[in-house]
């Protein structure tokens, strides 16, 4: 639900800044938060036909 802060950025705002270590980018509000606050898609069972998705979380390496 990329609302609030994201909506205020405007369509032409720059790409999000990488997060500091131990934080992840919350796509839904467009800012960095503790990774544990976000819930990722359920993992695919072994042998699933579709490729594993890129994570929406973008922790700083």
């Amino acid at each position: 639900m990329r609302r609030g802060p994201r909506s205020l950025r405007g369509r032409d705002a720059p790409a999000p800044t990488p997060c500091v270590p131990a934080e992840c980018f919350d796509l839904l509000v467009a800012h960095c938060v503790a990774c544990g606050l976000l819930r990722t898609p359920r993992p695919k069972p072994a042998g699933a036909s579709s490729p594993a998705p890129r994570t929406a979380l973008q922790p700083q390496e």
Epitope: M1, L28, L37, L38, P41, P53
Partner: antibody
Framework: EVQLQESGPSLVKPSQTLSLTCSVT????????WNWIRKFPGNKLEFMGY???????YYNPSLKSRISITRDTSKNQYYLQLNSVTTEDTATYYC???????????WGQGTTLTVSA | DIVLTQSPVSLAVSLGQRATISCRAS??????????MHWYQQKPGQPPKLLIY???DLESGIPARFSGSGSGTDFTLTINPVETDDVAIYYC?????????FGGGTKLEIK
């Protein structure tokens, strides 16, 4: 596995306030996003709003003057309050939670509300 | 608000054949290189069930008969082959812009 369960009245009179509860098990409402969605007769789905991990709320502008979403983290429940209901609010109300892309992968079974005098 | 227009409103497909449902958005739902478009199946008396997220990623536990494609404003859900259990209403949903919106639904029946 996350489980959600809606509870509340099945009949409300026009002009009254609707109050619904979503009870969550299998995860804490202090992480993620916690939504209310409704489905009208005729099959239209409407996103109503959410409360997230920080307690931040978002409301669909079509409802903004009438809606409130709150939570009680000690009970792991969140709530919908809709004021001044009319017959147009007759619908099935769902609570649901999305993952990081906003796709809602866990839903409650829904509770059917009729607004009638 | 982003308006999602689904077509057809209903379709009847023979068992074992392909069903194709289209969803067109009134503006792009892409951001950060991701298409924020998702597909759901809903049967009577049940909540919607997530099938596809991010336009083409198959949700865990969903049969590979379901697939999604598209980007920007034009998206497609394909069911191939169609089975009896697929009779339902299918919805697209965008989570790119506030407020999130759903398509009007496509009712799938068996011919």
């Amino acid at each position: 596995e996350v489980q959600l369960q809606e509870s509340g009245p099945s009949l409300v009179k026009p002009s009254q306030t609707l109050s619904l509860t979503c009870s969550v098990t299998g995860d804490s409402i202090t992480r993620g996003y916690w939504n209310w969605i409704r489905k009208f007769p005729g099959n239209k789905l409407e996103f109503m709003g959410y409360i997230n991990y920080s307690g931040t709320t978002y409301y669909n502008p079509s409802l903004k003057s009438r809606i409130s979403i709150t939570r009680d983290t000690s009970k792991n429940q969140y709530y919908l309050q809709l004021n001044s209901v009319t017959t147009e609010d007759t619908a099935t109300y769902y609570c649901a939670t999305p993952h990081t892309y906003g796709a809602m992968d866990y839903w409650g079974q829904g509770t059917t509300l009729t607004v009638s005098a | 608000d982003i308006v999602l227009t689904q077509s057809p409103v209903s379709l009847a497909v023979s068992l074992g054949q392909r069903a194709t449902i289209s969803c067109r958005a009134s503006e792009s739902v892409d951001d950060y290189g991701i298409s924020f478009m998702h597909w759901y199946q809903q049967k009577p008396g049940q909540p919607p069930k997530l099938l596809i997220y991010r336009a083409s990623d198959l949700e865990s536990g969903i049969p590979a008969r379901f697939s999604g494609s598209g980007s920007g404003t034009d998206f497609t859900l394909t069911i191939n082959p169609v089975e009896t259990d697929d009779v339902a209403i299918y919805y697209c949903q965008q989570t790119s812009k506030d407020p999130w919106t759903f398509g009007g639904g496509t009712k799938l029946e068996i011919k």
